[in-house]
Each structure stands twice: as structure tokens, then as C-alpha cells.
């Protein structure tokens, strides 16, 4: 029970009405540190008129029917106060002597018992008719979290008695539960911002501010959604929330206009081979919109080239791409551009890069293999392949010779210098087939092997040979 009141920093004396009896011996039993320095407190109404109360226990035993009903006395029902103020309130009850078993008073808030170091204190005032008990509760510097419904509980003769609630309403400035958020928007495209603040006290009204100017001279009830029809340049938005306690201001948020990205910077060549270049770059400013992909533009730097540009597309991340299928020993100009949803950036500054010399693209020609039986060697001859400038400078040849006979297989290779176009290889196995292939070598690597040339190595003097670089499936000529 109790009536709603506006009550801040109420002193204990104000909580009680009615005449005060003479001082009685007091059993002072605090549940935690007492909030008051006084050892004696005035009791509640002592006229012993027990109010009819819905919370009175239902007593059923024959003996109990003689007991008068017991209930908590009415107290203040609604306390309204500002944040950071102090508040004190109480429950009181008169227990006649006829009740033998009573337990302490416990405080509850919103259905949960308040345990631990709360500022509560219980005072007992005995007299010839029974005892008056006052449970006092105080909160220093109240916060919004102290809002709620407080009540007392007590067991009398094993029956639970509950007081009427005391509703504490802590009022303060509006409190933002949703502030506008930074967004990146397309130029001249509508977007929404949301602002929500709560009390108590309600209502909370919202004003929007754009670049230090109020958008609405009439406020909107919280929550408020501001629809901005479109922007052409970056703007800062915030909202003001007003209630009966004053005003608060949200954080200011930047609304950025999406633009094309800035060009990439720091384009570097990480590695070059004869036919590929590994390029890296640092993305430019993304224009307030995530980069989607990048384009690597490659053109031959030589004056004689026709100026056509090769374009290679790749994902925006990682900022790395291997350009392939390039000519060996060639000069290229390379630039990078990246795009977001608005469009492509300008290209980065062009940088020069070169591929290294390549491996030969053709195999040696006119391969002939002869068996020199007297020296037990193979005499191998060939013609130098036509090597282009970009294939690099010839440094030698690799000769692969495979020996096969019943139950035996031997795969060997020799490297010879570029001087001359012949080589001699000792016979490894008799009564066998020897397959010979030759590849040219430059600094750029090893070229393709020629087609295999087979020669049969007899047990004694009979020899078959294949005097050309075409495959020799069987005996082609004999010498």
C-alpha cells in the first residue's frame, strides 16, 4: 500500500507517523553495517491497530484461530528521486506476544532476495504487548540499476508474510540505448539513422543535428529514425535526447560518401623469371567502399612493340599477382588499378620490369649416333638449334642416354659445353638398346629434348644405327 510520492533524501524521522512512546530498551541487530549512527529509533504506530492486509497469513489450526492477524504496516508506495541522491525506506510490523516463532525480515527486489552487503538494518522495540520490528533499507547515490520494486518478507509461526511493494523510480538524464552509427553511403542516395534514448522520466524527445545544425526544430519521440534523402559530401550527425531532467548528446558519427578508390602505390617487382613477373602493391584509400578486385596492366616497353596492353584481373587481396605467359628477356611497363562498387581507381605510376632470358625453345637437330666398336664408345653428333635472342646464350647440351637389355635398365645423362656439336659416350651394356636424346642449355634453363634416337648395341660387331633425330622404332640402317 501507500501513495505515490516524490521523495528525495528522506530522513528516517519522516518515515513514521503517530505518537512516539517513551524510549524503550532496544535490541539493535543490524544485518550489515548500519546506515545510521543512532542507537535508538522511534517505533512505528503503537496503537496496536493491526490493519487488515491481504498479505496476512491464513491460520488454520484450532489454537491459531485465537491469534490476531499479522501483517506489515502500510508505508510509502512510490519513491521518485534523481540519480546520485540517497534514499531510505522501511518496512515495519507489530508482532503480538501470542506469536512465539518469528524469523528475521529479509529484503527482496523484483522477486530476488537482496543478499550480501546491502545497507539494511533491523530494529526491535519490545513492550508488554509484543514487539515492533522496523527493517530499514538505504541506498547511497542511487543509480538506474536501483530502479525496481522492493518488499519485505518475514516468517511468523512458519507462515510467510510479504509487505506491499515500495517502488523506487530513479530518474535521470536520457540514456542512449541506440546511437547513430557511422555508415558509408552512395552519393545522393537516401539512408536512415536511428537514435533511441530512455528515461525515466519518459517521454524522451529527440533532435537531430547535422554538421552542428539542427535538422528538426520539432523533436521526435524516442526512438527516432532520421531519413536523409542523400548527401553530396561527408557529414557528421548526432542526436540530442531531452526529457524532464535535461538533455544528453549522442556521439557524433561521420557519414562518408563512397568514391572511387585512390590508385595503388608502391608497386614493386618481387621476382622475375623468363616468362613471369611477380608484382606487389599497396592499395590506395578504398573510397569508403571495400576493394573488390584489381587489374594489372602490362605493356611491352620496347619502342618497336605495337603498344597493346595486356590486362590481368585478380582479387583485391592479397596485394600480389604473378603475371605469366610473358616473353623471355623482354622489358615491360606495369601498372595496377583497383575497383570498388563505385568504379575503378586511376592506375598507379607505371614501373619498368624485365623478364630473364628463357630456355631454348627448340631441340638440337640432325642427331646421329655411331658405335665405335674398336673403342667401345658411342659417337654422337648433332646440329646446333636455332636459338633466339630471348632464349639466351647457349652454354651447353644435356645428353640423355638410356640403356635397356633383358633384365637391365640404366638411365644416364651427360652435360657437354657448347663448343662443338658432338660427344662420345662409353658403351654401358652390350646386347642392348641405347636411346639417345639431346637438349640445348642456356642460362635461362634447359630446352626441350630431341626426339629419341635408338641404336642397338650387339654382342659383337654387328651394329644398327639411326642417323637422324626422328624416332627409330627399329633397325633403320646398318653400317
Amino acid at each position: 500500500g501507500g501513495t505515490a510520492e516524490k521523495w528525495e533524501e528522506t530522513e528516517l524521522d519522516q518515515l513514521f507517523s503517530g505518537p512516539l512512546p517513551g524510549r524503550l530498551p532496544v535490541n539493535h541487530r543490524p544485518f550489515s553495517a548500519p546506515h545510521s549512527s543512532r542507537d535508538q529509533l522511534p517505533p512505528p504506530q503503537t496503537g496496536r491497530s493491526h490493519p487488515a492486509h491481504t498479505a496476512a497469513p491464513q491460520v488454520t489450526s484450532t489454537a491459531s484461530k485465537l491469534l490476531p492477524p499479522v501483517a506489515f504496516n502500510h508505508t510509502i508506495g512510490h519513491i521518485v528521486l534523481s540519480e546520485h541522491k540517497n534514499v531510505k525506506f522501511n518496512c515495519s510490523i507489530n508482532i503480538p506476544n501470542t506469536y512465539q516463532e518469528t524469523a528475521g525480515i529479509s529484503w527482496w527486489k523484483d522477486g530476488k532476495e537482496l543478499l550480501g552487503a546491502h545497507h539494511s538494518i533491523t530494529q526491535f522495540y519490545p513492550d508488554e504487548e509484543g514487539v515492533s520490528i522496523i527493517a530499514l533499507f538505504s541506498i547511497a547515490s542511487v543509480q538506474r540499476s536501483d530502479n525496481g520494486s522492493y518488499f519485505c518478507k518475514m516468517k511468523v509461526n512458519n507462515r510467510e508474510i510479504v509487505s506491499d511493494p515500495i517502488y523506487v523510480e530513479v530518474q535521470g538524464l536520457p540514456y542512449f540505448i541506440k546511437q547513430p552509427e557511422s555508415v558509408n553511403v552512395t552519393r545522393n542516395t537516401a539512408f536512415n539513422l536511428t537514435c533511441q534514448a530512455v528515461g525515466p522520466p519518459e517521454p524522451v524527445n529527440i533532435f537531430w543535428v547535422q554538421n552542428s545544425s539542427r535538422v528538426n526544430e520539432k523533436p521526435e519521440r524516442s526512438p527516432s529514425v532520421l531519413t536523409v534523402p542523400g548527401l553530396t559530401e561527408t557529414a557528421v550527425f548526432s542526436c540530442e535526447a531531452h526529457n524532464d531532467k535535461g538533455l544528453t548528446v549522442s556521439k557524433g558519427v561521420h557519414i562518408n560518401i563512397k568514391v572511387i578508390p585512390s590508385p595503388p602505390t608502391e608497386v614493386h617487382i618481387l621476382n622475375s623469371t623468363a616468362h613471369s613477373i611477380l608484382v606487389s602493391w599497396v592499395p590506395g584509400f578504398d573510397g569508403y567502399s571495400p576493394l573488390q578486385n584489381c587489374s594489372i596492366q602490362v605493356k611491352e616497353a620496347d619502342r618497336l612493340s605495337n603498344g597493346s596492353v595486356m590486362v590481368f584481373n585478380t582479387s583485391a587481396s592479397p596485394h600480389l599477382y604473378e603475371i605469366q605467359q610473358l616473353q623471355a628477356l623482354a622489358n615491360y611497363s606495369i601498372a595496377v588499378s583497383c575497383r570498388n562498387e563505385i568504379g575503378w581507381s586511376a592506375v598507379s605510376p607505371w614501373i619498368l620490369a624485365s623478364t630473364t632470358e628463357g630456355a631454348p625453345s627448340v631441340a638440337p637437330l640432325n642427331i646421329t649416333v655411331f658405335l665405335n666398336e674398336s673403342n667401345n664408345i658411342l659417337d654422337i653428333r648433332w646440329t646446333k638449334p636455332p636459338i633466339k635472342r630471348q632464349d639466351g646464350e647457349l652454354v651447353g647440351y644435356r645428353i640423355s642416354h638410356v640403356w635397356e637389355s633383358a633384365g637391365t635398365y640404366k638411365e644416364l645423362s651427360e652435360e657437354v659445353s657448347q663448343n662443338g656439336s658432338w660427344a662420345q659416350i662409353p658403351v654401358q651394356i652390350h646386347n642392348a638398346t641405347c636411346t639417345v636424346r639431346i637438349a640445348a642449355i642456356t642460362k635461362g634453363g634447359i630446352g626441350p629434348f630431341s626426339e629419341p634416337v635408338n641404336i642397338i648395341i650387339p654382342e659383337h660387331s654387328k651394329v644398327d644405327y639411326a642417323p637422324s633425330s626422328t624416332p627409330a622404332p627399329g633397325n633403320t640402317d646398318s653400317m
Partner: antibody, heavy 121, light 112 residues
Framework: QIQLVQSGPELKKPGETVKISCKAS????????MSWVKQAPGKNLKWMGW????????TYADDFKGRFAFSLETSATTAYLQINNLTNEDSATYFC??????????????WGQGTTLTVSS | DVVMTQTPLTLSVTIGQPASISCKSS???????????LNWLLQRPGQSPKRLMY???KLDSGVPDRFTGSGSGTDFTLKISRVEAEDLGVYYC?????????FGGGTKLEIK
């Protein structure tokens, strides 16, 4: 108790500039705004606009855009009204009033004592 | 701007007698939120204005209940049931529904 104390009377010549102060006490300065009201002799009270004491965002009534500027010195809990290029028509008493938007609308609940500006050549 | 017109300009009343001041607006002061932002101020001689009433009829704290406000739309009235000496001064109505806020010309209450 909230108090708004304004600076003393001003005598200025046309073309000059005046800056009137309004010192607030008794409440958190940044939790409300300050309105300015002009009371010219024999004329209606005229609302000039208001400034948010937290953010400094100002709103001006149309008749007071241009030569008039509201400002703050938050650390000194003081609001200012500056009028540039004074004319004879600026002669009036200027009031500051605490302001924000409550459940009953604009509050206008506490007023300064007023500052009398006389513009005369 | 909304024009607020007060009548009479001057009101001479004997102490203990009632008084009535009228305020008319050039546009309805009923806002889209259902509230009517019509307010009254009292400026006692040599003092700054003081809020008296808001939302047509709600008294500010400390204002005696002999003051009552009424009206709707564009017509509003402030009544004093029994004038006392402390009531003398200039009464202003003002509206906060439309931008900019505007004031009436004032009604001077003097004691006969």
C-alpha cells in the same frame, strides 16, 4: 537552486560589438541549453534562439541570423550572446533562460535578471 | 511566425476579486503529438520572467492553485480566482508548438 546571473548594463555606439554573459550555478551546466530573449521597450518579448550547453549547437530564429552569435565557456558554466555591428534597434533588455525540451515542451523555467543594452551615437 | 494576441493590455483588479486574461494564436497550437504547447509567464516589476503554467493548464511548482489555465486550438485563458498583491506584473502567453517560439504582447495586471 538554479541561478542565472547576467552581466551588467552596456552602452555602445552603432557599429560596435557587445558580448553579454550569463553565468549559471546550481545545476550541471551541460545537461541543458540556454535560450536568449529580447525585450525591446514597448515591444513583445522575442525569442532569439538557443544553444545546447553540451554540444554548442545553436539554433537561431530567422530575425537573429547573421549578426548574432551564441557561445559557451563550459568550464566557467557561462553562456554568451554576442551582437556585432550594433544598430539602434538592438537597444533592449536581453534575458538568458534555462532551456530544454521536457514532457511539457520547451522548459524556459529559470531566467537571468536581464542585461540592458543601449545603442546610441 | 505564429502571432500571439493578448487582451486586455491592462487589467485593474481589486484584491480578492477574480481576473481573466485572454490569449489568441494565429494558428492552432495543437501539436501532432496531441499536446498543446501554450505557456504563461509572469514578469513582476523589476524582475525577470517566471514560468507560471505550461501545457495550457499545468501549474509550475510553487504556483498557487488560484491560477487556472484553459482553452484549446487558438483560444486560451488564464484566470486568477482571487487576486493577491503578489500577483501584479505583466503576464505573457507564449507558444512552443511552432518554430520559432513566439510571445504575446503582455497583459499588465495592476491593483485598483
Amino acid at each position: 537552486q538554479i541561478q542565472l546571473v547576467q552581466s551588467g548594463p552596456e552602452l555602445k555606439k552603432p557599429g560596435e560589438t557587445v558580448k553579454i554573459s550569463c553565468k549559471a550555478s546550481g545545476n550541471t551546466f551541460t545537461t541543458y541549453g540556454m535560450s536568449w530573449v529580447k525585450q525591446a521597450p514597448g515591444k513583445n518579448l522575442k525569442w532569439m534562439g538557443w544553444i545546447n550547453n553540451y554540444s554548442g549547437v545553436s539554433t537561431y530564429a530567422d530575425d537573429f541570423k547573421g549578426r548574432f552569435a551564441f557561445s559557451l565557456e563550459t568550464s566557467a558554466t557561462t553562456a554568451y550572446l554576442q551582437i556585432n555591428n550594433l544598430t539602434n534597434e538592438d537597444s533592449a533588455t536581453y534575458f538568458c533562460a534555462r532551456d530544454y525540451y521536457g514532457s511539457g515542451g520547451w522548459v524556459f523555467d529559470y531566467w537571468g535578471q536581464g542585461t540592458t543594452l543601449t545603442v546610441s551615437s | 511566425d505564429v502571432v500571439m494576441t493578448q487582451t486586455p493590455l491592462t487589467l485593474s483588479v481589486t484584491i480578492g476579486q477574480p481576473a481573466s486574461i485572454s490569449c489568441k494564436s494565429s494558428q492552432s497550437l495543437l501539436d501532432s503529438d496531441g499536446k498543446t504547447y501554450l505557456n504563461w509567464l509572469l514578469q513582476r516589476p523589476g524582475q525577470s520572467p517566471k514560468r507560471l503554467m505550461y501545457l495550457v493548464s499545468k501549474l509550475d511548482s510553487g504556483v498557487p492553485d488560484r491560477f487556472t489555465g484553459s482553452g484549446s486550438g487558438t483560444d486560451f485563458t488564464l484566470k486568477i480566482s482571487r487576486v493577491e498583491a503578489e500577483d501584479l506584473g505583466v503576464y505573457y502567453c507564449w507558444q512552443g508548438t511552432h518554430f520559432p517560439r513566439t510571445f504575446g504582447g503582455g497583459t499588465k495586471l495592476e491593483i485598483k
